[in-house]
Interface confidence: low
């Protein structure tokens, strides 16, 4: 009996972690990335009249709980950390398009949801509207990749998320990304990489 776990692309980047979703004994989604969330929140000024907007920097820390589900055309990664004070959900969809050369399938990141608790004291100091908030992406189409390939991008990418905390926008910063939410052929092994344009340019410059 053999259970081969061949995690590719490992590095010593202290911010990065690997997230794996398994179904029916095999890997169906793999994601390796570092993520940070810039979260604005209001605090009372010392006069208790004015509101001041502070900023919490929340890193996705190692040791997070990983869940998810896989499907033919939709896959989801869920990551929970700091005793579930924070939760990240990433929804991936696979679509077929009619091109001049014929049908062409791609997958993309179609939705991001970040749930945070501004009553969590290590990141938020006396937030006025302390409690659970949800920040969602709007009409997202990111990390677009040909079907059967993994997406790789070392460069930083930002995604804006509209928060349920009124008039607040959360910024998600992704870096050192390597993701494959569909069509994993071999257990724990990424397929051929589709590199982001920034990384492609850097390779040409080298």
């Amino acid at each position: 009996e053999q259970e081969v776990e061949n995690l590719s692309g490992l590095s010593t980047n202290p911010e990065k972690d690997i997230f794996v979703v398994r179904e029916n004994g095999t890997t169906c989604l793999m994601a390796e990335f570092a993520a940070k969330f810039i979260v604005p929140y209001d605090v009372w000024a010392s006069n208790y009249v004015d509101l001041i907007t502070e900023q919490a920097d929340i890193a996705l820390t190692r040791g997070a709980e990983v869940k998810g589900r896989c499907g033919h055309s939709q896959s989801e990664l869920q990551v929970f950390w700091v005793d579930r004070a924070y939760a990240l959900k990433m929804l991936f969809v696979k679509e077929s398009h009619n091109m001049s050369k014929g049908p062409e399938a791609t997958w993309r990141l179609s939705k991001v949801q970040f749930v945070y608790d501004s009553s969590e004291k290590t990141h938020f100091k006396d937030a006025v509207s302390a409690g659970k908030h949800t920040a969602n992406s709007h009409h997202l189409s990111a990390l677009v990749t040909p079907a059967g390939k993994s997406y790789e991008c070392q460069a930083q990418q930002t995604i804006s998320l509209a928060s349920s905390d009124p008039q607040k926008t959360v910024t998600m910063i992704l870096s050192a990304v390597h993701i494959q939410p569909f069509d994993i052929i071999s257990d724990f092994v990424f397929s051929e990489e589709h590199k982001c344009p920034v990384d492609e340019r850097e390779q040409l410059e080298e």
Partner: antibody, heavy 119, light 106 residues
């Protein structure tokens, strides 16, 4: 916070039986693969058995040295994993640890329970 | 089964010294985990998936390797690093551990 509590160890005669229990908390137990690992001065750290999560139909795996003698089982409703040990031998003497393998490695270890097989 | 051979079995290092512990597998493995154990305590996951530091592990530790050859390195030895370190593979059943390296402080 992840907590693991092993129990059921003690002194048993060669050929005897013993059942170890482990109660876990602080993570989604039904998703976790659970391992038993033992440690003795003679053999060092030795993996004993593994039972996978619900998604993997609770598949079980054993070390050759315990196959046919030990049985691993779990009760997800009680967040517990068990190791039924039969036909015990003196070389089974060790500290037994139950460990969740719910990410990529043996992330958390309890204090272990001591098993002594001696006449 | 895959046999993991650690070397050296016992070593001592002075504070500030660079330390490297190696783990050689009898056949190729996908990646290696490392555990730290101090007397009278349970082992602790120290490095997982070859190069990832477990939570709370000082950044002076690093892990590297591939195939049959893996290593754990401490860039500058400190007194609190004195412990026994074990490598472990979870690529092929049965999961196996190395015999351990007992690292002492001079």
């Amino acid at each position: 916070e992840v907590k693991l509590e092993e129990s059921g160890g003690g002194l048993v005669q060669p050929g005897g039986s013993m059942k170890l229990s482990c109660t876990a908390s602080g993570f989604t137990f039904s998703d976790a693969w659970m391992d038993w690992v033992r440690q003795s001065p003679e053999k060092g750290l030795e993996w004993v058995a593994e039972i996978r999560g619900k998604a993997d139909n609770h598949a079980t795996y054993y070390a050759e040295s315990v196959k046919g003698r030990f049985t691993i089982s779990r009760d997800d409703s009680k967040s517990s994993v068990y190791l039924q040990m039969n036909s015990l031998r003196t070389e089974d003497t060790a500290i037994y640890y139950c460990i969740p393998y719910y990410r990529y490695a043996m992330d958390y270890w309890g204090q272990g329970t001591s098993v002594t097989v001696s006449s | 089964q895959i046999v993991l051979t650690q070397s050296p079995a016992i070593m001592s290092a002075s504070p500030g010294e660079k330390v490297t512990i190696t783990c050689t597998a009898s056949s190729s493995v996908s990646y290696m985990h490392w555990f730290q154990q101090k007397p009278g305590t349970s082992p602790k996951l120290w490095i997982y998936a070859t190069s990832y530091l477990a939570s709370g592990v000082p950044t002076r530790f690093s892990g590297s390797g591939s195939g049959t050859s893996y290593s754990l390195t401490i860039s500058r030895m400190e007194a609190e690093d004195a412990a026994t370190y074990y490598c472990q593979q979870k690529s092929n059943y049965p999961w196996t551990f190395g015999g351990g390296t007992n690292l002492e402080i001079k």
